[in-house]
Interface confidence: low
Amino acid sequence: SAPFSFLSNVKYNFMRIIKYEFILNDALNQSIIRANDQYLTAAALHNLDEAVKFDMGAYKSSKDDAKITVILRISKTQLYVTAQDEDQPVLLKEMPEIPKTITGSETNLLFFWETHGTKNYFTSVAHPNLFIATKQDYWVCLAGGPPSITDFQILENQA
C-alpha cells in the first residue's frame, strides 16, 4: 500500500458535521453492520434498523485540496472508522471528541469522499490508492478494487 509520509505536512481542520445518521449500502445492496465490538461487515438486511448509522464530518485541508475530506463516526457513539493497510479490516477507534486538527499518521481517520451519480467512494487519505470496501465473508476493509466492492449508496433519513 502507498506510504503516507508525503502527506505528513498536510493539516486537516475540522469544519462541521455534514451528514447525520445515514446508512451505507454496497453495490450488492448489502448494508454495513456491526460484526462485533471492533469491526464492521456487510450483510443483506430485511430490517434496516440493524444497519450501522454513520455521521460524516468535513475537514478542510491546508493544501487547499479540491477533494472533500471526511471522517466517519458511528452515530451516537465516540467510535470513528480508522483505516489500516490493504486487505486489513477498518477498525473502530474510540475518541472522546471529534479531532479538531488531523495531521501525519492520524490521517488514517480521514477519507476522500467522491460521488459519481448515486455511487459514493471513500478513499483513505493515508493510503490514497485504497478504498473502503466490502468483501465476501470478510470484514469491511481497505482495498484497491475488485473483487472487493468499493462503491456505496448513501441512504439518508433512516433514523
Epitope: D37, Q38, Y39, V52, K76, Q78, L79, P96
Partner: antibody, heavy 122, light 106 residues
Framework: QIQLVQSGPELKKPGETVKISCKAS????????MNWVKQAPGKDLKRMAW????????TYADDFKGRFAFSLETSASTAYLQINNLKNEDTATYFC???????????????WGQGTSVTVSS | IQMTQTTSSLSASLGDRVTISCRAS??????LNWYQQKPDGTVKLLIY???RLHSGVPSRFSGSGSGTDYSLTISNLEQEDIATYFC?????????FGGGTKLEIN
C-alpha cells in the same frame, strides 16, 4: 462459557511496579475491546482505560495517564495492566471487563474478571 | 455526565419489592446499565439499555426509566440478591458509574 480470570492479590511498597493479568476464554479475544476498572476502598468504580484487542491501542481516562500501561498477549488471550512507581492511592481492586456496544451505541461491560486486590504500603 | 445514586444503603426483607434509583446529570437516551457486586467482590451485568436483561439474569430483576431518571426493581427479594448495585451510563466517555446502593436484609 465466557470467563475472565485475573491474577492473584498483590502487596507492594511505594515506588515498586505491579503487573496484573486477565485471561479470557469462551469467546474470540480479538473481537471485543477490554476495559480496566479501578475500585478504591469506599469509592466508585472508575473506568481506567479501554484497549483495542485487535491493534493493542489503548484509550486512557484522564486520571490514568502516565504511570499506567495496558498491554496484550493476543496468542494467550490475555490482557495486562501495569502500574509503575506505585503510590498509596493505587491501593484498590482492579477489574478487567469485556466491552460491548448494544444497539450500536450503548456501551456496557458484559463480563468481568473476579478482581485483583493491590495493596500499596510501606 | 455524572451519575448519582442518592440512596447509599437500603434495608429490606426477603420477599419484598425493592426499587433502587439512579439519576444522570443530563439525558442519556436510555443508555443505562445496572451491575451487581456481591460481598465477595464479583461483578455482573444485570441490565443493559435501561430494561434489557443480560443472559442468565433472573426475571425478578427489571429496569425502567428515560431521560435522566432510571430505576432497578427486584420484585421478590431473595437472599442471594444481597449485594451492592451500581448504575452506569453507556452514552458518553468515560462511561461513569454511580456511587452504588448497598442492599441489606432487615
Amino acid at each position: 462459557q465466557i470467563q475472565l480470570v485475573q491474577s492473584g492479590p498483590e502487596l507492594k511498597k511505594p515506588g515498586e511496579t505491579v503487573k496484573i493479568s486477565c485471561k479470557a476464554s469462551g469467546y474470540t479475544f480479538r473481537n471485543y475491546g477490554m476495559n480496566w476498572v479501578k475500585q478504591a476502598p469506599g469509592k466508585d468504580l472508575k473506568r481506567m482505560a479501554w484497549i483495542n484487542t485487535y491493534t493493542g491501542e489503548s484509550t486512557y481516562a484522564d486520571d490514568f495517564k502516565g504511570r499506567f500501561a495496558f498491554s496484550l498477549e493476543t496468542s494467550a488471550s490475555t490482557a495486562y495492566l501495569q502500574i509503575n512507581n506505585l503510590k498509596n492511592e493505587d491501593t484498590a481492586t482492579y477489574f478487567c471487563a469485556r466491552g460491548i456496544y448494544y444497539y450500536g451505541s450503548s456501551y456496557a461491560m458484559d463480563y468481568w474478571g473476579q478482581g485483583t486486590s493491590v495493596t500499596v504500603s510501606s | 455526565i455524572q451519575m448519582t445514586q442518592t440512596t447509599s444503603s437500603l434495608s429490606a426483607s426477603l420477599g419484598d419489592r425493592v426499587t433502587i434509583s439512579c439519576r444522570a446529570s443530563q439525558d442519556i437516551s436510555n443508555c443505562l446499565n445496572w451491575y451487581q457486586q456481591k460481598p465477595d467482590g464479583t461483578v455482573k451485568l444485570l441490565i443493559y439499555y435501561t430494561s434489557r436483561l443480560h443472559s442468565g439474569v433472573p426475571s425478578r430483576f427489571s429496569g425502567s426509566g428515560s431521560g435522566t431518571d432510571y430505576s432497578l426493581t427486584i420484585s421478590n427479594l431473595e437472599q442471594e440478591d444481597i449485594a451492592t448495585y451500581f448504575c452506569q451510563q453507556g452514552k458518553t466517555l468515560p462511561y461513569a458509574f454511580g456511587g452504588g446502593t448497598k442492599l441489606e436484609i432487615n
